[in-house]
Interface confidence: medium
């Protein structure tokens, strides 16, 4: 058993049929010695008396808010949550496996630049009685500070018969060094509590590996005289690290016909313009990627040819 | 070339070669052996690999003030990785093809380090770890990790040379 926060405790249980459970001793936070009784949740049934209460925690029915009283007055509370371990593996019932980039990916994180700011998100089908707490650091043995905000519900989607809820959190490294080569990974830890179930999820990454630039901005076409060719130009996204002579991007320009089956013409360039042939009813799209490190491409910025 | 007294390197040549190094480091990575390695979390234990750190002056302001600190750090790293790529870790079984990206990467690391340091001028180089002949599992693991680490190192080096070519070239 360990303390998650004041008056909230997590009991770690091996979860299998007829498991012995854990013996837990609760102590009433009071100078009083006599006439103390214990109850669980809203029940008025007295579970025991005395300054301490010893219970055998085996299942969710044994978890909840234990309260010690004296003469009708509440003295203190202890909320017991359960953390299940089945076949040696901690349960992951609360969050959905996003399966990208690999199985057992519950947390996904992205950064728009090298400033040390990043966003993580996760999915769940649970709509109520759900709380999240996020902590982060650079490295784990001698951790350096990363400050995370509160997790917020960022999207709701309908998937078949189910509703899916996306939560996200923004974090910022306290002393970021955008130009340095990272040697210690960022660690992100999410505590999830659903009713009386506790779970924790972690992710470890380098900012360089989660970079995904915003799409190029101000995408424009300039027809070239007496030609089917057009000059496409664009600019670096505002959110990308500066100076651009140091934090450079590379770009992919694509000409795509109306039909998905039509052949795509692609050009790769380090410049912020390119000359392409504009077909009727086609569209021109441009996306960006770090020039020197193969992290994710941005989403496409697009304009129609006409 | 970076010479004693701190004159400038051939920024544009360094930029071109460092960008080529980035491409090679990424094309070499999947080809380091029959990789069925589980993608492990990135450990905190790359203790013997030189990193370009915050105080090394490789940021735009540091380059403007005095690029020599940063260039020396990059040179150390290039020599370190060049030695590793020429070691038993990459030459032993399972063997790589002679024209593999690793061989080109090895040659390019050497080329860039020579551009940075002409004859007769010697910066201190970091001690290269000496590893006894290793088994294939050890080589495969090390190749994978070394190339991952090299990708990060050459990305920073390439940014330095791109910025230098754009802003510090005579």
């Amino acid at each position: 058993i360990w303390e998650l926060k004041k008056d909230v405790y997590v009991v770690e249980l091996d979860w299998y049929p007829d498991a012995p459970g854990e013996m837990v001793v609760l102590t009433c936070d009071t100078p009083e010695e006599d006439g103390i009784t214990w109850t669980l949740d809203q029940s008025s049934e007295v579970l025991g008396s005395g300054k301490t209460l010893t219970i055998q925690v085996k299942e969710f029915g044994d978890a909840g808010q234990y309260t010690c009283h004296k003469g009708g007055e509440v003295l203190s509370h202890s909320l017991l949550l359960l953390h299940k371990k089945e076949d040696g593996i901690w349960s992951t019932d609360i969050l959905k496996d996003q399966k990208e980039p690999k199985n057992k990916t519950f947390l996904r994180c992205e950064a728009k630049n090298y400033s040390g700011r990043f966003t993580c998100w996760w999915l769940t089908t649970i709509s109520t009685d759900l709380t999240f707490s996020v902590k982060s650091s650079r490295g784990s043995s001698d951790p350096q500070g990363v400050t995370c905000g509160a997790a917020t519900l960022s999207a709701e989607r309908v998937r078949g018969d189910n509703k899916e809820y996306e939560y996200s959190v923004e974090c910022q490294e306290d002393s970021a060094c955008p130009a340095a080569e990272e040697s210690l990974p960022i660690e992100v830890m999410v505590d999830a509590v659903h009713k009386l179930k506790y779970e924790n999820y972690t992710s470890s990454f380098f900012i360089r590996d989660i970079i995904k630039p915003d799409p190029p901005k101000n995408l424009q076409l300039k027809p070239l005289k007496n030609s089917r060719q057009v000059e496409v130009s664009w600019e670096y996204p505002d959110t990308w690290s500066t100076p651009h002579s140091y934090f450079s991007l590379t770009f992919c320009v694509q000409v795509q016909g109306k039909s998905k089956r039509e052949k795509k013409d692609r050009v790769f360039t380090d410049k912020t313009s390119a000359t392409v042939i504009c077909r009727k009813n086609a569209s021109i799209s441009v996306r960006a990627q770090d020039r020197y490190y193969s992290s994710s491409w941005s989403e496409w910025a697009s304009v129609p040819c006409s | 070339r970076a010479v004693p007294g701190g004159s400038s390197p051939a920024w544009t040549q360094c930029q071109q070669l460092s960008q080529k190094l980035c491409t090679l480091a990424w094309s070499a990575h999947p080809l380091v052996g029959h990789m069925d390695l589980r993608e492990e979390g990135d450990e905190e234990t790359t203790n013997d690999v030189p990193h370009i750190q915050c105080g090394d002056g490789c940021d735009p302001q540091g380059l403007r003030d005095n690029s020599q600190f940063c260039l020396q750090r990059i040179h150390q790293g290039l020599i370190f990785y060049e030695k590793l790529l020429g070691s038993d870790i990459f030459t032993g079984e399972p063997s790589l093809l002679p024209d593999s990206p690793v061989a080109q990467l090895h040659a390019s690391l050497l080329g860039l380090s020579q551009l940075l340091q002409p004859e007769g001028h010697h910066w201190e180089t970091q001690q290269i770890p000496s590893l006894s002949p290793s088994q294939p599992w050890q080589r495969l693991l090390l190749r994978f990790k070394i190339l991952r680490s090299l990708q990060a190192f050459v990305a920073v080096a390439a940014r330095v040379f791109a910025h230098g070519a754009a802003t510090l070239s005579p």
């Epitope: - | 069925d36 390695l37 905190e44 234990t45 013997d48 002949p133 290793s134 088994q135 294939p136």
Partner: antibody, heavy 117, light 108 residues
Framework: QVQLVQSGAEVKKPGSSVKVSCKAS????????ISWVRQAPGQGLEWMGG????????NYAQKFQGRVTITADESTSTAYMELSSLRSEDTAVYYC??????????WGQGTLVTVSS | DIVLTQSPATLSLSPGERATLSCRAS???????LAWYQQKPGQAPRLLIY???SRATGVPARFSGSGSGTDFTLTISSLEPEDFAVYYC?????????FGQGTKVEIK
């Protein structure tokens, strides 16, 4: 002459963890890898994983992935193997061995780990 | 992972006889990175052969290894009383090392 000396026998409860140490003497610890092999009573040898202390890089058998952590402390020339979420089937003798190009040429004396409620 | 199958499971022989132990791999063992170990009750294994055919330091000449690809053999030319033990083959050509299930050489 390299020698590997392991920590003593352990009795553990199901669900708990065990950490076995393996101290090397008489050679350059960093210059080779250390593998961990276990042997259940009356059974054969089973490779669990290995570490290259110089780099701190570990490689694990698929079967133990996520449950075993192999580490090394160069300053004390000691390798460690921690196995979590123990079950009765983990009762075995755990060996560390120096793992070089010629196979596992030097072995520790073995550590018996008994998992019992 | 490469699966190693040893045969026979038990070999009953008398001192002075020749012992031939087989180890078959489910896929080719790259570079013949195959080792043989001897283990006596209550003791740690001892390396006998590495690289399929090279004898480890201090191993008597009566032990020899041969084979390549997927089929490997350990031969004990003339069994001594101290040779009665369990023998394991192990491949180390792959990112995951594996052992065979062992062959017990017992006194007939």
């Amino acid at each position: 002459q390299v020698q590997l000396v392991q920590s003593g026998a352990e009795v553990k409860k199901p669900g708990s963890s065990v950490k076995v140490s393996c101290k090397a003497s008489g050679g350059t610890f960093s210059n080779y890898a250390i593998s961990w092999v276990r042997q259940a009573p009356g059974q054969g040898l089973e490779w669990m994983g290995g570490i290259i202390p110089m780099f701190g890089y570990a490689n694990y058998a698929q079967k133990f992935q996520g449950r075993v952590t192999i580490t090394a402390d160069e300053s004390t020339s000691t390798a460690y193997m921690e196995l979590s979420s123990l079950r009765s089937e983990d009762t075995a003798v755990y060996y560390c061995a120096r793992d070089i190009y010629a196979g596992m040429d030097v072995w520790g004396q073995g550590t018996l780990v008994t998992v019992s409620s | 992972d490469i699966v190693l199958t040893q045969s026979p499971a038990t070999l009953s022989l008398s001192p002075g006889e020749r012992a031939t132990l087989s180890c078959r791999a489910s896929q080719s063992v790259l570079g013949n990175y195959l080792a043989w170990y001897q283990q006596k009750p209550g003791q740690a294994p001892r390396l006998l052969i590495y690289g399929a055919s090279s004898r480890a330091t201090g191993v008597p000449a009566r032990f020899s290894g041969s084979g390549s690809g997927t089929d490997f053999t350990l031969t004990i030319s003339s069994l001594e009383p101290e040779d009665f033990a369990v023998y394991y083959c192990q491949q180390y050509s792959h990112i995951s090392l594996t052992f065979g299930q062992g062959t017990k050489v017992e006194i007939k």
